[in-house]
């Protein structure tokens, strides 16, 4: 089981949208995948995916989860507030047929205060 998370760094403006992506790959098929997003070590959500669907669509304050086959788990924060700033980690574990687990590298989210004199959002793209 491999987990690749991106972007490494994400800087957005307060009130806008932030998208964090977790790519989950395994050479063999799986029946149920447990996923988890944490922020600064605290669990935001811990749903599972089975039959192509997420058991939960929300993830923390203003967070929405989606699963796009074959491998992309997306956490969308909208609207972003200042307290969304932090270090996000995606973790995944195949529960069926056999326990396998892996986690991504940290995504550091920086939220700039809403200031009309600043440039528009700078959203990094997911590598690969």
């Amino acid at each position: 089981l491999s987990v690749q998370q991106g972007p490494n760094l994400l800087q957005v403006r307060q009130g806008s949208q932030a998208t964090l992506v977790c790519q989950v790959d395994q050479a063999t098929a799986w029946e149920r995948l447990r996923v988890k997003w944490t922020k600064d070590g605290a669990i935001l959500c811990q749903p599972y995916i089975t039959n192509g669907s997420l058991s939960l669509g929300v993830c923390g304050p203003q967070g929405r989860l989606s699963w796009q086959a074959p491998s992309h788990l997306t956490l969308q924060l909208d609207p972003v507030s200042l307290n969304h700033s932090g270090a996000y980690v995606c973790w995944a574990a195949v529960e069926i047929p056999e326990l396998e687990e892996a986690e991504g590298n940290i995504t550091r989210l920086f939220v700039d205060p809403d200031d009309p004199t600043q440039n528009r959002n700078r959203i990094a793209s997911f590598p690969g």
Partner: antibody
Amino acid sequence: QVQLQESGPGLVKPSQTLSLTCTVSGFSITTGGYYWSWIRQHPGKGLEWIGYIYTSGRTYYNPSLKSRVTISVDTSKNQFSLKLSSVTAADTAVYYCADMADKGGWFAYWGQGTLVTVSS
Amino acid sequence: DIVMTQSPDSLAVSLGERATINCKSSQSLFSSNTKRNYLNWYQQKPGQPPKLLIYHASTRLSGVPDRFSGSGSGTDFTLTISSLQAEDVADYFCQQHYETPLTFGDGTRLEIK
């Protein structure tokens, strides 16, 4: 360019242990998300998956051979190895090493294969 | 274990004609989670290791001639060579990676008529 090369004795006596090594060049076997695999092919026949070892060190074996198989990795030499104990004539085959990635699920790179004959 | 059954065992086709090889699995290789079929096709020429042609049942590996195509889903799969060339003479194997143990078909020997 990734290359794999099998090495080891071509003749093994019955009841002994078959030992083969696969040397990987052009790629580090410590790279995450890869399965380092052994596959064999009996003369004139189909392919049989023996097992593989994941980057984490976790091993997966074919249940038909599990009691006799050990796959291990030597990261310092960028090699992985196969040991098959208590061999019989039925273990005579061409043995291949190959790699498989989580992002694919297919055997992308193969060694050229080495014929191992079990005979007294 | 998932049993992979290939047919025919051998096949003789004239140059420029179509060759069709079938592969049937004892259980579905389609995952509703990833929307993928866990089925690969390999070509093996004498004295050489197998070479990947098609993955996920229908995706042709980069560099593989477009006369090779894969189709099917679930339990029934087909490898088609639209116009046989002399260099296509080889053994062809299907392989499932839906679950371990990974298993291969027994192979189809393709020859020129």
